[in-house]
């Protein structure tokens, strides 16, 4: 008999959490906590904000970001883009996988200057060994990261 | 040969649905339908709003709540918090797992005071046997339940 | 020893992406790309917008749609409904599985008539062989498709 996975071949999974160091301001992807609290890596590795695939296959990848602000100093037209992107050695540029655009400033009202919004992405993609997935948010300064439960990034093989 | 799961060891999974009894107004977590319609439990149990883990492992847990209202009464908080929380015998207080904050009242307009919003949470967490996961919404008065398709709570082992 | 899945019995999974042809305007469900780019079918089939189950079991099904507009013309409903629905040979009408209602037009303001919003649905449902799942959005004119990363539909067995 042949089985798909033996017990010592655990199903790859990871959940990474937001931290104070997540926002670099460098134009790069968000960075993540990989070990403390709720964060873990099992059969996947991490490098400079990226989940790195060690075993090829189909993965459900997901990310949530907590957006927030006080009023809309950038203007109400401001659009926030939250996306999951693939980096592959076979191609020089990042490839969009799953993307959302939101206009959260419409949530600020005269009776409530402080606004909160949340963006969730999740979907199945095929990833080869060595390929990487990163999260980007534009404008990242509107992402709340502090406590790890509101902004996060993860994956598991399906 | 050793395999990870034998056919009689089904992969734990559950999907619980909103019902008229879900909102208690008692300050406790939301309650859920476990058997009727789309609701089911497979390898997980249920107790007073909580999914109870019987087999330790990594689980993708998720919840969606349908929010809605007419305008924004002053008595209601301008921020809605929707979260998944863990209860463990090893710690007296609930632990935040996945949380979202939203300001849905900004969706009410001059031409339409009725507003609808939705909050989705999902992520992988490690759960031990006997640990419980619950859903809380503050302010729960804004949760719209209707038929079990708009507000729900589920999990499966990954 | 008996194992749940042998290596040649791959775990059913699919991810379908939005395309220019997705919006029919016919009152039917959204249509999807099944092969190009990020789209794939593995152990599931496709027919006229529907994912068709070939192997009975519990599936995590999901969909995201990107909503957007310029202001809110009177002809458009102020509420957008995004849902996943089941078609079964045993019943003449579609059955609601997972549904969200949103009022995205509240995001348009006098100084910024362009708005973006996103709706994500995901949950576990039991599906029999031959049953189908489709995505519907009312009003579909507000769905923004672009490149397949912003609106999509998928499933995998859990």
């Amino acid at each position: 008999l042949i089985q798909e996975r033996r017990s010592h071949e655990v199903n790859p999974a990871a959940h990474l959490t937001g931290a104070n160091s997540s926002l670099t301001g460098s134009g790069g992807p968000l960075l993540w906590e990989t070990q403390l609290g709720l964060a873990f890596l099992r059969g996947l590795s991490y490098h400079d904000g990226a989940l790195v695939v060690t075993k090829a296959g189909y993965y459900y990848i997901y990310s949530k970001v907590q957006l927030g602000g006080v009023g809309c100093p950038l203007g109400l037209a401001s659009t926030i883009t939250h996306g999951l992107y693939k980096r592959t050695p076979r191609y020089p540029e990042e490839l969009e996988l799953l993307v959302s655009q939101q206009s959260p400033c419409g949530r600020a009202t005269s009776s409530s200057r402080v606004w909160w919004d949340s963006s969730f992405l999740g979907g199945v993609v095929h990833l080869e060994a060595g390929e990487e997935v990163v999260v980007r948010v534009l404008d990242e300064r509107l992402v709340r990261l502090r406590d790890g439960t509101r902004s996060y990034f993860g994956a598991f093989m399906v | 040969l050793i395999q990870e799961r034998r056919s009689h060891e089904v992969n734990p999974a559950a999907h619980l649905t909103g019902a008229n009894s879900s909102l208690t107004g008692s300050g406790g977590p939301l309650l859920w339908e476990t058997q009727l319609g789309l609701a089911f439990l497979r390898g997980l149990s249920y107790h007073d709003g909580a999914l109870v883990v019987t087999k330790a492992g990594y689980y993708y847990i998720y919840s969606k709540v349908q929010l809605g209202g007419v305008g924004c009464p002053l008595g209601l908080a301008s921020t809605i918090t929707h979260g998944l929380y863990k209860r463990t015998p090893r710690y007296p207080e609930e632990l935040e797992l996945l949380v979202s904050q939203q300001s849905p009242c900004g969706r009410a307009t001059s031409s339409s005071r009725v507003w609808w919003d939705s909050s989705f949470l999902g992520g992988v967490v490690h759960l031990e046997a006997g640990e419980e996961v619950v859903v809380r919404v503050l302010d729960e008065r804004l949760v719209r339940l209707r038929d079990g398709t708009r507000s729900y709570f589920g999990a499966f082992m990954v | 020893l008996i194992q749940e899945r042998r290596s040649h019995e791959v775990n059913p999974a699919a991810h379908l992406t939005g395309a220019n042809s997705s919006l029919t305007g016919s009152g039917g469900p959204l249509l999807w790309e099944t092969q190009l780019g990020l789209a794939f079918l593995r152990g599931l089939s496709y027919h006229d917008g529907a994912l068709v189950v070939t192997k009975a079991g519990y599936y995590y099904i999901y969909s995201k749609v990107q909503l957007g507009g310029v202001g809110c013309p009177l002809g458009l409903a102020s509420t957008i409904t995004h849902g996943l629905y089941k078609r079964t040979p045993r019943y003449p009408e579609e059955l609601e599985l997972l549904v969200s209602q949103q009022s995205p037009c509240g995001r348009a303001t006098s100084s910024s008539r362009v708005w973006w919003d996103s709706s994500f649905l995901g949950g576990v449902v039991h599906l029999e062989a031959g049953e189908e799942v489709v995505v519907r959005v009312l009003d579909e004119r507000l769905v923004r498709l672009r490149d397949g990363t912003r609106s999509y539909f998928g499933a995998f067995m859990v």
């Epitope: 957006l67 927030g68 602000g69 006080v70 009023g71 100093p73 | 921020t79 | -």
Partner: antibody, heavy 121, light 107 residues
Framework: QVQLQESGPGLVKPSGTLSLTCAVS?????????WNWVRQPPGKGLEWIGE???????NYNPSLKSRVTMSVDKAKNQFSLKLNSVTAADTAVYYC??????????????WGQGTTVTVSS | AIQLTQSPSSLSASVGDRVTITCRAS??????LAWFQQKPGKPPKLLIF???DLESGVSSRFSGSGSGTDFTLTISSLQPGDFATYYC?????????FGQGTRLEIK
């Protein structure tokens, strides 16, 4: 480290216009902040006058709205306040302050030292 | 406009004392409340934001709590430099408003 410095005449005649400028140093005015004006009459509490963003969006205290104008000069990295039709009741220490408007950190964290404006003939 | 009422208006205490100042909002403001310290001739200094978050560089002797309409600033062990006037401020809705202040004096 961002610093703010108010400047402007210390004496304004009744019915005249109070004009103040706040110079921003150590950082750009073109960031996700609100640039505020707050005043404090002698021996009294704090009163918010209004705010302006780098993109020129303004919000004013309704009690002063008809008399207030705020603007931003991105080239000079400064913002300004104009309050017309002043009376003795407008005599106060005027502060400029930065309010962070990002997700993780709120609050008026940087203040100027304040400038005293007296309305008198 | 949202009114903030601080109590007490003035307070006498000694070095080492634990002091609590309360701020009540006329309507709910979630956690959009800040606390400031002001000394004579100086601008206000931000101590606490979002009701309970300690501003960088501020002593951990200061703590804030509350949500909705009732908020508290606590100084765990008074130091000589803490004698000043304290203001709460709501930034939840326009117009931004301040409490009337609490003057903390040496006993």
């Amino acid at each position: 480290q961002v610093q703010l410095q108010e400047s402007g005449p210390g004496l304004v005649k009744p019915s005249g216009t109070l004009s103040l400028t706040c110079a921003v140093s150590g950082g750009s005015i073109s960031s996700i902040n609100w640039w505020n004006w707050v005043r404090q009459p002698p021996g009294k509490g704090l009163e918010w006058i209004g705010e302006v963003s780098h993109s020129g969006i303004t919000n004013y205290n309704p009690s002063l709205k008809s008399r207030v104008t705020m603007s931003v000069d991105k080239a000079k990295n400064q913002f300004s306040l104009k309050l017309n039709s002043v009376t003795a009741a407008d005599t106060a220490v005027y502060y400029c302050a930065r309010e962070r408007a990002v997700a993780d950190y709120h609050g008026m964290d940087v203040w100027g030292q304040g400038t005293t404006v007296t309305v008198s003939s | 406009a949202i009114q903030l009422t601080q109590s007490p208006s003035s307070l006498s205490a000694s070095v080492g004392d634990r002091v609590t100042i309360t701020c009540r909002a006329s309507q709910g403001i979630s956690s959009a409340l800040a606390w400031f310290q002001q000394k004579p001739g100086k601008p206000p200094k931000l101590l606490i934001f979002d009701a309970s978050d300690l501003e960088s560089g501020v002593s951990s002797r200061f703590s804030g709590s509350g949500s909705g309409t009732d908020f508290t600033l606590t100084i765990s062990s008074l130091q000589p430099g803490d004698f000043a006037t304290y203001y709460c401020q709501q930034f939840n809705s326009y117009p931004i408003t301040f409490g009337q202040g609490t003057r903390l004096e040496i006993k």
